[in-house]
Structures are given as C-alpha cells and as structure tokens.
C-alpha cells in the first residue's frame, strides 16, 4: 500500500472511530435493565454517563440528568474523564492529521514536517482509542460487579419468605453504548497505528538516503606509465533521493466518546 493510501485510510478509520467515541459518550444506553430471569416489568430502565432514563409501555420516556458531581461514584467520574480525554485527544489528532495529509499542500511544508505531524496525530489517535477502550472496560467491569452483587442479594436470604414483602432489585447489563465504545476505540487505535506506519514512509532514512561527498584536498592525480590521469570527485552533483517505502500511513485514530454513566 502506498504511503498516501495508508495515511488516508488511517485518517478515515480514525475519523470513524472518533465519531463512534463521541456517539458512545453521548448515548444513554451504557447499561440497560436485565430482563432475563427477572419479573417482567412494564417499565424499562437504562442509564448513560450523564443521565438515566425510564421507558414505559406506552413509549413515554423520561430522562433525568445526574445533576451532582460529588454524589456520583468515583468510577463513573473516571469513566467520564477517560471518554472526554479520548474525545479531546481525537479532536487534536484530527486537526493535526489534516495538515499532515500528503494529499494536502500547505505552503512550503516539506515531507519531514508532514512525517512528524503524521506521527504526532497517530500517537494522539492511539492514546485516544486506548482511553476510550479503558473507559468502556472500566464501566463494563463496574456493571459485572454490580450485576453479581444484585444477583446474590436476590437469591440470598429468601428461604422463608412467608408473609414478607419482596423487593425485586433491578439488575443492569451491558448497553449498546459499551459495544459502540469498544469498536470505536479499536478503530481509533487502528487508525492511529496506520498513521504511525505511514510516517515511516514519509521520513527519509539517514542510512539509505544521505548522499556523502568525498572532497579531495587537492586533485588526486595518478601517474601511470601510460600517463593516464584519473580524478575522482563524487558528491557535489549527487541528488538526495527520497524513497517511499509504501508503508501505509495511519489515519486519524478514532476518538472515543465519553460514555454515559449508568446507575447500576
């Protein structure tokens, strides 16, 4: 694959991933009510990073924002932070990578500058993708922990329930936003790697490309019996050649969206 194609593809993949990260961050379905082996309710609960929602059987949906910072679990705050970091880095990565694209000419920017920018954007996309993946994974781990705790509470101490009032705990399982976040983070990461690979193709390799000039202090004259004079003078007119290794350049890494916090 040519460097231009690699860089362009990396940019597109990262862009798609970045959009996915934003989408995941804004989605309300980070966790959804678990319906398996539960009494069937006419109310469906789901939660995001920023608000929780309830949908009734009529379709009426009511969402309430988490209007507190201090009252929220530290893990939720951490997930929010990771997703926001992913988005911010993705934005910067996209801006940098636009100027780094080989197909775009800006002033007299040479290839070495574009190579550096490509590498920078690639690294930004990689970190953005990793940040989103970690954020989503932390949230998923939180859900799993709470799910099994809820399950244990549901089935423990219910042996002698004669006359007792049951309270059914709402359990939450993985919502669509988690899968969107994982895929988006992965795409952003892959796009970032592709940008880094493309950078290699844009960078002149010293060992391969540097033209060395050998200057004689005087003129090298070799007297031979036949009076033949040979002079050697390499370098002054030798051109520096840039070789493109065809490494695919990575595109903008997809930026991960801060995922919505679901109350679990």
């Amino acid at each position: 694959m040519s460097v231009t194609a690699c860089q362009g593809l990396g940019f597109v993949v990262s862009l798609i991933g970045f959009a996915g990260i934003i989408a995941a961050t804004c989605m309300d379905q980070w966790s959804t009510q678990d319906l398996y082996n539960n009494p069937v309710t006419a109310v469906f609960n789901y939660q995001g990073l920023w608000r929780s929602c309830v949908r009734e059987s009529s379709g009426f949906t009511e969402c309430r924002g988490y209007f507190t910072l201090l009252g929220l679990p530290a893990m939720l705050q951490a997930v929010r932070a990771l997703m926001i970091v992913g988005i911010v880095l993705g934005v910067i990565g996209i801006l940098v990578s636009i100027f780094a694209l080989k197909c775009i000419r800006i002033g007299s920017m040479d290839d070495s500058a574009k190579a550096k920018m490509t590498l920078t954007s690639g690294i930004l996309f990689i970190i953005s993708g990793i940040s989103a993946i970690i954020g989503v994974s932390v949230f998923a781990n939180m859900l799993v922990t709470n799910f099994w705790m809820s399950t244990a509470n549901m089935y423990s101490g219910m042996g002698g329930m004669g006359g007792m009032v049951q309270t059914v705990q709402t359990r939450y399982t993985f919502g669509a936003a988690l899968f969107v976040g994982w895929v988006a983070g992965g795409l952003t990461l892959i796009g970032g790697v592709m940008m880094c690979i493309a950078c290699r193709g844009l960078t002149p390799d010293d060992s391969n490309f540097k033209a060395v000039s050998y200057h004689a202090s005087g003129q090298n004259v070799a007297y031979r019996p036949g009076g033949f004079k040979a002079s050697t003078g390499f370098g002054s007119n030798t051109r520096n050649k840039k070789i493109y290794d065809g490494g695919a350049r990575t595109e903008d890494d997809e930026q991960s969206h801060p995922t919505k916090y679901d109350y679990v």
Partner: antibody, heavy 119, light 113 residues
C-alpha cells in the same frame, strides 16, 4: 374525543369460541396499547393482555394464554379478542381499555361486552 | 403474580366526610430509575366501566376533582377523598402498573348514608 365502542352481548354454548370487537375513534389507533380486562359477576378486575396496534406485539397474562387471542385491524381502527373453548367460568363482562401515555395506566375504557356461556 | 390487597372491602360514610382506603402490594411498585410508584387507582360506578383517577400513585388524571388524593410509596398506598360527595358512590380499585401481568385489588366499595 376518545371513544371505544365494543360489540354487543354474546350468548354462546360451552366449548364454542367467540370474537368480540372494540372500535377506537378520536385518537391515533396505532400509537397506543389496547388492553383487555375481564370482570366476572360480582368480582374484581382481571387483566387479560395487551396488544400494540402499531406492530401487533402482544403480551398476555399467563392465565389467559391459549384462551384469549388479541388481534387488530388497523384499517378500521378495531381491536379484537377471541376466546376459545368456552366454559361457564368465562361468563363475564369484557372491557377493552386504551393504554394511557403516563404511568402504564388504562385511561379510556369501552362500555364492556357481556359474555354468557350457557348450554 | 403481584398480589394487591385492599382494605376495607366496604365502608359507609356521610356526605362531606373524609374517607381513606388502603392498598398494599406484595412487591414494591417503586421504580428506582425515576423514583415513581407504578400504582393506579380507578373508580367504577354501578353499571359503568372503570374510570382512571390517579396514576404514579399520586398524580391526578386531568378532570378528576382535587378532593381525590393518592399517596404512599413502595408497597403501601392510600386513596383519600377529602369531602365525599353523593356521586362518589362507587367501587375503588388499585392496580399494579409495574409488573406484568397487571393485577388489581379486590376493590373497596364506598357507600353513602
């Protein structure tokens, strides 16, 4: 205004089937659930099931599965309930009721269809 | 299925009196997601279909007189009529609107002296 007009009283033999109707008017039929409720003589209310006319999705009370079948005809804005293998236990007044937008309530009710199962 | 228990089964009062009737559910009807109780109250007058009075345990349906008040949370609920009128003669049913199948209480019959 919202109205639910139910079909007239039915007198049927044990073992037979009956299909009663509930014609809706005054609102968008496909946007609200339609519920069916049984009230046996001098008894309380029993929820039979619900159907969403928009896509035909149904949810039944386990007790009435196999006994009641809920359907709709969108073109005439009419909901139907068929009761099969009738016995004297099925003698009751059957109401259709629209699912309210809030609180999973039943906000408008038909006048009821009286079913008498007798030999 | 959720059991709904209403008490008393009947009561007789004079016009203008305050009336309170109770409804208990076998499981909590409080949804943690929105902190709403999915309990509904209906009024059924003789020879008529039921009429929606209150949903979400305490929200009056439009057109319902403000003498009807619903309260309670979790498993214990109350319907209060602040000043009974002759037209309030009816059977009052509470309904679980949270779990399928929806279930109704056996009703409280209100009679006027």
């Amino acid at each position: 205004q919202v109205q639910l007009q139910q079909s007239g009283a039915e007198l049927v033999r044990p073992g037979a089937s009956v299909k009663m109707s509930c014609k809706a008017s005054g609102y968008t039929f496909t946007s609200y659930n339609m519920h069916w409720v049984k009230q046996a003589p001098r008894q309380g209310l029993e929820w039979i099931g619900t159907i969403y006319p928009g896509n035909g999705d149904t949810s039944y009370n386990q007790k009435f599965k196999g006994k009641a079948t809920l359907t709709v005809d969108k073109s005439s804005s009419t909901a139907y309930m068929q009761l099969s293998s009738l016995t004297s236990e099925d003698s009751a007044v059957y109401f259709c009721a629209r699912g309210g937008y809030y609180g999973n309530s039943l906000d408008y009710w038909g006048q009821g269809t009286t079913l008498t199962v007798s030999s | 299925d959720i059991q709904m228990t209403q008490s008393p089964s009947s009561l007789t009062v004079t016009a203008g009196e305050k009336v309170t009737m109770s409804c208990k559910s076998s499981q909590s009807l409080l949804n943690s997601g929105n902190q709403k109780n999915y309990l509904t109250w209906y009024q059924q007058k003789p020879g008529q279909p039921p009429k929606l009075l209150i949903y979400w345990a305490s929200t009056r349906e439009s057109g319902v007189p403000d003498r009807f008040t619903g309260s309670g949370s979790g498993t214990d609920f109350t319907l209060t009529i602040s000043s009974v009128q002759a037209e309030d003669l009816a059977v009052y049913y509470c309904q679980n609107a949270y779990y399928y199948p929806f279930t109704f209480g056996s009703g409280t019959k209100l009679e006027i002296k």
